[in-house]
């Protein structure tokens, strides 16, 4: 039976009809009392006092309502949940993930996990209603957990008309290769000992380091991974592992040449709730590699939205060459990652200036052959974008990737809903399209426009009458991603390039074929 529920937009927790709850008001000491009425949360401020007993984990501040028994935790940065039990910065799980308390919420199939408090799970052996739920990491959230000591974190997903458990695609902290680091590498305990410039690291117990804070003599040295070795470490929460080096007889430090363990192409997909012409409104967490590129124009004040882009490494964005025909100076460009609404700043967005951009030398502005460009983000260190649930790289395809004809893939962007619309979309959209066979991706299928071997076609193959809402890219989506699932990860197959109109039956969109440019990409991204 259909149940009316409320979703608290601030915390993403769900509540049944007439259920009440407390929530802290961000960036203030106020607390609100909310209750679920016909699918809408109604909230007002209530007086609170300090809790009579500690109930919050991880340094959370407990407050309880003055006139009834509920309590609320004000969580320190990096923690969330009713009792601050959720570690929002955990990027991977250790061992079997029994102690994993991160926010990954996507199953291996790509399905979105179900909230553990959902009434649909009430009869399941593991749900947020269990008396020991908090101890097991279960609660009013849909994050992957391993409450039954299985081999890795899992969750319940709704498929084939029922709820069943499925393993999650949460990254493991040591995917058989501990000589790479996750997140900022604070937990890195590998044996790399060279810096990015090729210099050898000094041992952490070297006499030269006397007076430095981070040495083998530090009281927390063991916990920080420092000792009688010269392996790269990140004891101070810097951007990535580093070490002390001697450069021209001068003591300094440098970031290390340790590869980051790839979490490319992993995402926390949520089923879009709203259909819109040409596709579906989406959240950035479902497409965390999507970038928005803005440009300052010489003639008009302010910035205007230019094109989409694709995050392929911490400091590099792929886009379409035709977006840069105006030859903007790099400092007139801005790249924004982690944004759901095109012109509304996101809470976790990251904004960058552009160091330089490289347009393919053989880009043809008549045919759009070689429609590819690379933008290097500006940063003070060797890292630019910081990985989070809303910012993550897409995987580049292997050179020999050949997906079957009609494989279902997806594209995303902030482009127009339809060709004749005067406006770009206010919110990120996604569209589901299928890869056309090369025999259906020719000039004769595209009004005699030139189609080269550097292009591929994809479109919505559903049969539809004149009112059908066929998915497609449109103006403003250019430079954005066409991604397909490969080996459990979303892999970049195409760059949105051109098309005839938008969403027309039997007229595919045309994309830059990324496998043809892997060497070009690698070559231009060299340090």
């Amino acid at each position: 039976s259909y149940q009316v529920i409320c979703r608290d937009e601030k915390t993403q927790m769900i509540y049944q009809q007439h259920q009440s709850w407390l929530r802290p008001v961000l960036r203030s000491n106020r607390v609100e009392y909310c209750w679920c009425n016909s699918g809408r949360a109604q909230c007002h401020s209530v007086p609170v006092k300090s809790c009579s007993e500690p109930r919050c984990f991880n340094g959370g501040t407990c407050q309880q309502a003055l006139y009834f028994s509920d309590f609320v935790c004000q969580c320190p940065e990096g923690f969330a949940g009713k009792c601050c039990e959720i570690d929002t910065r955990a990027t991977c799980y250790e061992d079997q993930g029994i102690s994993y308390r991160g926010t990954w919420s996507t199953a291996e199939s790509g399905a979105e996990c179900t909230n553990w408090n959902s009434s649909a799970l009430a009869q399941k052996p593991y749900s947020g209603r269990r008396p020991d739920a908090i101890r097991l990491g279960l609660g009013n959230h849909n994050y992957c957990r391993n409450p039954d000591r299985d081999s890795k974190p899992w969750c319940y997903v709704f498929k084939a008309g029922k709820y069943s458990s499925e393993f999650c695609s949460t990254p493991a902290c040591s995917e058989g290769n501990s000589d790479c680091y996750f997140g900022n590498g604070s937990a890195y305990r590998g044996t790399h000992s060279l810096t990015e410039s090729g210099a050898s690291c000094l041992p952490w117990n070297s006499m030269i380091l006397i007076g430095k804070v981070y040495t083998a003599q530090n009281p927390s040295a063991q916990a920080l991974g420092l000792g009688k070795h010269n392996y790269c470490r990140n004891p101070d929460g810097d951007a990535k592992p580093w070490c002390h080096v001697l450069k021209n007889r001068r003591l300094t430090w440098e970031y290390c040449d340790v590869p980051s363990c790839s979490t490319c192409g992993l995402r926390q997909y949520s089923q879009p709730q709203f259909r819109i012409k040409g596709g579906l409104f989406a959240d950035i967490a479902s497409h965390p590699w999507q970038a928005a590129i803005f440009a300052k124009h010489r003639r008009s004040p302010g910035e205007r939205f230019l094109c989409g882009g694709i995050l392929i490494s911490s400091c590099w964005i792929l886009s379409a060459a035709h977006c840069f025909q105006e030859r903007f100076p790099p400092h007139h460009l801005t790249v924004i990652l982690g944004r759901t609404y095109r012109v509304v700043p996101g809470e976790e967005e990251q904004k960058f200036e552009v160091e330089k951009y490289i347009v393919h030398k053989e880009f043809d502005d008549d045919t759009y052959d070689n429609d590819i460009a690379l933008l290097q983000l500006k940063s003070d260190s060797s890292r630019c974008a910081q990985e989070s649930s809303v910012v993550r790289t897409v995987c580049l395809p292997p050179a020999d990737l050949q997906l079957p004809d009609w494989t279902e893939c997806e594209l995303s962007g902030y482009g127009k809903h339809e060709a004749l619309s005067p406006f770009y979309s206010e919110r990120l959209k996604e569209a589901h399209v299928r890869l056309y066979p090369s025999s259906r991706c020719t000039s004769q299928h595209l009004l005699n426009r030139t189609v080269t071997d550097n292009m591929l076609c994809a479109g919505d193959t559903r049969s539809g009458g004149p009112q059908a809402n066929l998915h497609d890219a449109c103006q403003g989506d250019s430079g954005g991603p066409l991604v397909c699932l490969n080996d459990g990860r979303m892999t970049l197959v195409g760059i949105i390039s051109w098309g005839l109109g938008c969403g027309q039956k039997d007229v595919p969109g045309v994309y830059t074929k990324v496998t043809n440019y892997l060497d070009w990409i690698r070559d231009n991204m060299r340090p």
Epitope: G198, D257, A399, L518
Partner: antibody, heavy 114, light 112 residues
Framework: QVQLVQSGAEVKKPGASVKVSCKAS??????INWVRQATGQGLEWMGR????????YYAQKFQGRVTMTRNTSISTAYMELSSLRSEDTAVYYC?????????WGQGTLVTVSS | DVVMTQSPLSLPVTPGEPASISCRSS???????????LDWYLQKPGQSPQLLIY???NRASGVPDRFSGSGSGTDFTLKISRVEAEDVGVYYC?????????FGGGTKVEIK
């Protein structure tokens, strides 16, 4: 520290093929280049492979005769040269490229002789 | 293809004296990403080549500071401020800016 260890010397007949391997340890995400050197001659760049995606670039001179592959699970790159002739007698080196070819294998001598 | 021309072909040196090797490219070797991938390698007798200088003027790890590189566009120079006996071997310049990548013909440095 990246270390590259190459397979042993080979003797081949003209027209045959040779496959040289290069096992990498350390950071194996960089291009692997193949460079050859005939006795008493200079260094000649043959091409490169990206161990991650497997994309390749071959120098025109070797196009059609050389194939560079990799097996990521064992961190090994391979260079196969076919239709061998006597002038292919040389030491073949693999070299890992990040900002330059900072790490080199010990070389594999391939002798082509009837 | 970019042709790299080195001079001299052979360089007899006296230990303690300076030495200089020139390398000229047939066209500019500034890469489209703005970098100039001009490297110098030394191949000592019976050994694999080793990196000395990368991107024109950056000394590789462990390379003594008597080695320095300079130049731009098409003209590049490797200097050894005071040659030591262990510096003998063949020096190669190399461009990695335009494919196919190419080496210079080499300069043999030997003690007088």
């Amino acid at each position: 520290q990246v270390q590259l260890v190459q397979s042993g010397a080979e003797v081949k007949k003209p027209g045959a093929s040779v496959k040289v391997s290069c096992k990498a340890s350390g950071n194996t995400s960089y291009w692997i280049n193949w460079v050859r050197q005939a006795t008493g001659q200079g260094l000649e760049w043959m091409g490169r492979i990206d161990p991650g995606g497997g994309s390749t670039y071959y120098a025109q001179k070797f196009q059609g005769r050389v194939t560079m592959t990799r097996n990521t699970s064992i961190s090994t790159a391979y260079m196969e040269l076919s239709s061998l002739r006597s002038e292919d007698t040389a030491v073949y080196y693999c070299a890992s490229y990040y900002y330059a070819m900072a790490y080199w294998g010990q070389g594999t001598l391939v002798t082509v002789s009837s | 293809d970019v042709v790299m021309t080195q001079s001299p072909l052979s360089l007899p040196v006296t230990p303690g004296e300076p030495a200089s090797i020139s390398c000229r490219s047939s066209q500019s070797i500034v890469h489209s990403n703005g970098n100039t991938y001009l490297d110098w390698y030394l191949q000592k007798p019976g050994q694999s080549p080793q990196l000395l200088i990368y991107k024109v003027s950056n000394r590789a790890s462990g390379v003594p500071d008597r080695f320095s590189g300079s130049g731009s566009g098409t003209d590049f120079t490797l200097k050894i401020s005071r040659v030591e006996a262990e510096d003998v071997g063949v020096y190669y310049c190399f461009q990695g800016s335009h494919v196919p990548w190419t080496f210079g013909g080499g300069t043999k440095v030997e003690i007088k």
